[in-house]
Amino acid sequence: DGCKDIFMKNEILSASQPFAFNCTFPPITSGEVSVTWYKNSSKIPVSKIIQSRIHQDETWILFLPMEWGDSGVYQCVIKGRDSCHRIHVNLTVFEKHWCDTSIGGLPNLSDEYKQILHLGKDDSLTCHLHFPKSCVLGPIKWYKDCNEIKGERFTVLETRLLVSNVSAEDRGNYACQAILTHSGKQYEVLNGITVSITERAGYGGSVPKIIYPKNHSIEVQLGTTLIVDCNVTDTKDNTNLRCWRVNNTLVDDYYDESKRIREGVETHVSFREHNLYTVNITFLEVKMEDYGLPFMCHAGVSTAYIILQLPAPDFRAY
């Protein structure tokens, strides 16, 4: 169908509550484009009827609420005047009871659900809520170990819990809760946040931290286009270089002739205490020779790799 396939990282989600995912892939979505969502390679688009539990809302796919059976790979197709991209998003739904201590922690939690407070400082936690404009969010309530947070040291301001004079006792399991209203119906959103305490005043030492990838394999079909971001946090004054290598050679040099695999242009976002750098690697067309090779992201002395692997055959199709 002429669409380029792009594989995004997994999203791990909680059942029985609303969830939304926005299909944006700059610079593709910055112009005049149409966006259509599909589930599990279905030819039938996701409904745009707002009464449907799962429906497309502008560029978003919206689950009201998410259910156990919604796990799977969703595709959004972005069609421009001269281009077509298909973005694959793997959604995994789990049953999580935030106040049930017998249930272990969650695997691969994103940074939004793992936050740090700095000992002895005034700091804050953020409740990350990503929903389209059609969803009206109410004020946020905060809980620690399932009890609503009260006290002079804690103040709620918009999506943040301000914590003054952070102490070691502030580590633990937090949750932020908001009521979401959509088409007159109300839903509860509850995000769990694991909070750790650090004594470091600044963002950290001079060793860069690779947030993604995490030394793992990525299932990808032969012949598809794949873009993988390397996300690195580092101090503002760092002089570290960030790059992608294969067989201990810069990918741009290794694939100098074919230019089939290229390193992207580095971008960064400046935060108060650190920078977040992103440099991607693009596989224009995945070939058999790419499987099993560690593609290494380097950031100063830090490294992390991805290994491409063929998807396991789906015997249900036979």
Epitope: S124, G138, L162, F271
Partner: antibody
């Protein structure tokens, strides 16, 4: 429909006190903080402070501590602001404004205070 | 306290043309969570202020998409793509990063 209905204009003498009200309707009063904002003639907006109607705890801008006292009556879904030891500089329009998922999402119509001898 | 700076007046604009209003903060409003805690309000003549944009670029439901917000950590712009008569008034920026919450002095949008 969310509404914040403020009390009417006040004309008071220097040194006196005044208590203005802000009656909330159309939402659960105790779920949202209530802010108070001052707009003096020819000046910008100034945040005075805010109160958590559920617990009654208030936070003030340093320069309004001792000048403003914020209280609520949960049974009446009403927030109050008392201003003490009034001077001519206190002449202004005072707004109540709700905050929740974002700050100042709904505003009252304003209460005009005139301090004059 | 964080000081918010705005010009008192914008350049007079014609109906149907675009307008830009600027605001500057004395400290970066970009939090380590990646969110920029800046809001824009419009106070029309004889009315109370009205929230237009929150967290720098998020349009409040019901506000026309002629309005958009952008900026860096300390320099912010409110853009109105096609100015209408009802857009006349004073535009205030405000920071919600930390207490005390502070406003800019307001910029008056005037028509040619």
């Amino acid at each position: 429909e969310v509404q914040l209905q403020q009390s009417g204009p006040e004309l008071v003498k220097p040194g006196a006190s005044v208590k203005m009200s802000c009656k909330a309707s159309g939402y659960t009063f105790t779920d949202y903080h209530m802010n108070w904002v001052k707009r003096s003639p020819g000046k910008s907006l100034e945040w005075i402070g805010r109160i958590n109607p559920d617990y009654g705890d208030a936070r003030y801008d340093q320069k309004f501590k001792g000048k403003a006292t914020l209280t609520v009556d949960k049974s009446l879904s009403t927030a109050y602001m008392q201003l003490n030891r009034l001077t001519y500089e206190d002449s202004a329009v005072y707004y109540c404004a709700r905050d929740g998922y974002y700050v100042f999402d709904y505003w009252g119509q304003g209460s005009t205070l005139t301090v004059s001898s | 306290d964080i000081v918010m700076t705005q010009a008192a007046f914008s350049n007079p604009v014609s109906l149907g043309t675009s307008a830009s209003i600027s605001c500057r903060s004395s400290k970066s409003l970009l939090h380590s969570d990646g969110i920029t805690y800046l809001s824009w309000y419009l106070q029309r003549p004889g009315q109370s202020p009205q929230l237009l944009i929150y967290r720098m670029s998020n349009l409040v439901s019901g506000v026309p998409d002629r309005f958009s917000g952008s900026g860096s950590g300390t320099d912010f712009t409110l853009r109105i793509s096609r100015v209408e008569a009802e857009d006349v008034g004073v535009y205030y920026c405000a920071q919600t990063l930390e207490f005390p919450l502070t406003f800019g002095a307001g910029t008056k949008l005037e028509l040619k």
